[in-house]
C-alpha cells in the first residue's frame, strides 16, 4: 500500500477558456503530482501484541517495506527515539543486536523485519497503552519511523493487525530512489504550476477541510500536523494512563498524528511532505522522522558526497567521513 495523494475531481474547464490543450495540461500536473508523492515511498509497519501467558509481556514486530537496504533499526518506547523515547534495542544487519531492559529478546525475523520481546515484570515493565516506535535507517530512503500501541480493547494473546503505517517522505535522500524521468516530471510539474498562477484557476470541488485550504490534500497538512508544526516534537505521555499528545495548540484532529520537527517545516519541500495518509488501525499512530538534522558536513554510511541523512547510531565514527563511513 502506498501513500497516495487524494486528487480532487476536476470540473471541466469553461468553454473557450483553455480548450482541449488546457484540459490536458490540467490533468497532467495532477498525474505527475501523484507520481511524485507515491513513487518509491517506503513504509514502516508496527505490530504490538500482549502475550496471553504473561499479561505484562509484549511482543513488538516491525517491518520495512521499501526497496532500499536497511542499515540500522532502533526500537524505543514512550515516543520516537531521540524525542523523549527510551531506547530498547538497536539492530544492525552486520554488527548484531544490542538490547536493554526491559527488552528480553530482539531478533531479525527476515532481512527487513524484526521482533522484540519485552519482560513483563519490574518497575520498567510496559503497560497496555505504552507506545512503541521502530525507526529504520535505510539507503537511499533515509530514516523512517512508525509507532504503535496495543488497541485499548485488546484481549491478551491478541494483537492489532500489523498495520502498515505510511510514513511521509522525510529525506532528501529519497530523491536518489526516484528515476531521472520522475525527477524531470516533478520539475515539469512545478513549471506548469507556475504557469498556471497567471491563468484563471479552474473550479475545483470544495475541500472537506475548509473552503480556504489548498484544494489538493497532497499539499495541505492535516489539522493535527499543522498544530504539531509549532513544537519540535509532539510530546508523548509515558505514564500508564491513556497517552496524550501535548502540542502548542489543541486541535480537533483525528486520533492518529504525524509531526515534523519545526525546522523541517521551514525547509522547501515537495508535495510528498504533506501526502495524505490513511488512518491506521486503532491504537497505532504514525510518526515522521525528518532525518535532515544531521550536522552539516557529516557523512553517514552509503551516502554520496556531501549528502547527509541522519545520525548513525552504530557509532559516531560513521559520521566522520571518510573514516568510519560504512
Amino acid at each position: 500500500m502506498r501513500t497516495e495523494a487524494q486528487v480532487p475531481a476536476l470540473q471541466p474547464p469553461e468553454p473557450g477558456l483553455e480548450g482541449a490543450m488546457g484540459h490536458r495540461t490540467l490533468v497532467l500536473p495532477w498525474v505527475l503530482l501523484t507520481l511524485c508523492v507515491t513513487a518509491g515511498t517506503p513504509e514502516v509497519w508496527v505490530q504490538v501484541r500482549m502475550e496471553a501467558t504473561e499479561l505484562s509481556s509484549f511482543t513488538i514486530r516491525c517491518g520495512f517495506l521499501g526497496s532500499g537496504s536497511i542499515s540500522l533499526v532502533t526500537v524505543s518506547w514512550g515516543g520516537p527515539n531521540g524525542a523523549g523515547g527510551t531506547t530498547l534495542a538497536v539492530l544492525h544487519p552486520e554488527r548484531g543486536i544490542r538490547q536493554w531492559a526491559p527488552a528480553r529478546q530482539a531478533r531479525w525475523e527476515t532481512q527487513s523485519s524484526i521482533s522484540l520481546i519485552l519482560e513483563g515484570s519490574g518497575a520498567s515493565s510496559p503497560c497496555a497503552n505504552t507506545t512503541f516506535c521502530c525507526k529504520f535507517a535505510s539507503f537511499p530512503e533515509g530514516s523512517w519511523e512508525a509507532c504503535g500501541s496495543l488497541p485499548p480493547s485488546s484481549d491478551p494473546g491478541l494483537s492489532a493487525p500489523p498495520t502498515p503505517a505510511p510514513i511521509l517522505r522525510a529525506d532528501l535522500a529519497g530523491i536518489l530512489g526516484v528515476s531521472g524521468v520522475l525527477l524531470f516530471g516533478c520539475v515539469y510539474l512545478l513549471h506548469l504550476l507556475r504557469r498556471h498562477k497567471h491563468r484563471p484557476a479552474p473550479r475545483l470541488q470544495p475541500s472537506r477541510t475548509s473552503p480556504q485550504a489548498p484544494r489538493a490534500r497532497a499539499w495541505a497538512p492535516s489539522q493535527a500536523s499543522q498544530a504539531a508544526l509549532h513544537v519540535p516534537y509532539a510530546t508523548i505521555n509515558t505514564s500508564c494512563r491513556p497517552a496524550t499528545l501535548d502540542t502548542a495548540h489543541p486541535h480537533g484532529g483525528p486520533s492518529w498524528w504525524a509531526s515534523l520537527p519545526t525546522h523541517a517545516a521551514h525547509r522547501p519541500q515537495g508535495p510528498a511532505a504533506w501526502a495524505s495518509t490513511p488512518i491506521p488501525a486503532r491504537g497505532s499512530f504514525v510518526s515522521v522522522e525528518n532525518g535532515l538534522y544531521a550536522q552539516a558536513g557529516e557523512r553517514p554510511p552509503h551516502t554520496g558526497p556531501g549528502l547527509t541523512l541522519f545520525p548513525d547510531p552504530r557509532g559516531p565514527r560513521a559520521m566522520e567521513g571518510p573514516l568510519g563511513v560504512r
Epitope: 552486520e94 544490542r98 547510531p313
Partner: antibody, heavy 114, light 113 residues
Framework: EVQLQQSGPELVKPGASVKISCKAS????????MNWVRQSHGKSLEWIGD????????NYNQKFKGKATLTVGKSSSTAYMELRSLTSEDSAVYYC???????WGTGTTVTVSS | DIVMTQSPSSLSVSAGEKVTMSCKSS????????????LAWYQQKPGQPPKLLIY???TRESGVPDRFTGSGSGTDFTLTISSVQAEDLAVYYC?????????FGGGTKLEIK
Amino acid sequence: EVQLQQSGPELVKPGASVKISCKASGYTFTDYFMNWVRQSHGKSLEWIGDIHPNNGSPNYNQKFKGKATLTVGKSSSTAYMELRSLTSEDSAVYYCATGYFDVWGTGTTVTVSS
Amino acid sequence: DIVMTQSPSSLSVSAGEKVTMSCKSSQSLLNSGNQKNYLAWYQQKPGQPPKLLIYGASTRESGVPDRFTGSGSGTDFTLTISSVQAEDLAVYYCQNDHSYPWTFGGGTKLEIK
C-alpha cells in the same frame, strides 16, 4: 572529531573502589550506546558491559556483575564505571568504546596495590 | 558464553608476504534471520586502543586498506593480509558480535621479520 577522553591512571588499595570516566565529544552522546572493556596486562579483551544514555539500564557480563556499575551523565556527555572491592586481579587498562566498538577511548590504567 | 579461539597465537613474516590467521567460535555466529555472520576483527598496535578492521565477517571498515580481507561463515573465520606492511605489526583480535556477552579471541600477534 569524535573523541572519548578517559580519566587518568588510578593507584588504589585492595578492597577500595574507583570510579573512572569517559567524556564523549564530537557527536551527540545520547545517539550511541557505550561499552566498557577490560584488558589485563599482555592479555586479551574482556567486555564488561554496555549502557545506552536513552535507557539507563546497563547490560553486564556475568563475570563483572557486582564488580562494575555503569552510569551516564547525559548533561555532561560522560559515561562512568565504578569498580568496587578491588583486588590485584582488577589491575588492568579499562577502555570505553562507543556503539559497536567503533571508536575507543584512550584507556585508563587501574593499578591495585597495597 | 561463546568462546573465541584464535590461531596461531603469534607469527613472524617478512614485509610483502601473505598472512592468514584463524578464528573459531564455539557456536555459530550466523544469524538465521538475515543470514549475516556477526563477527568482527580488530587491530591493536602497541600502546594503542584496538581499532575496528572488519565487521560482518567480511565487510571492511571504511579507511581500512584493501589488503585486509575477512572471510568465513558459521564457526570458522579467517583474516588475510595479502601483502604485509611494516605498519601492520600488531595483535589481531576476533570478536563475537552474535550474542551477549560479547567475547574476544585471545589474539594473534603479528611480528615483522
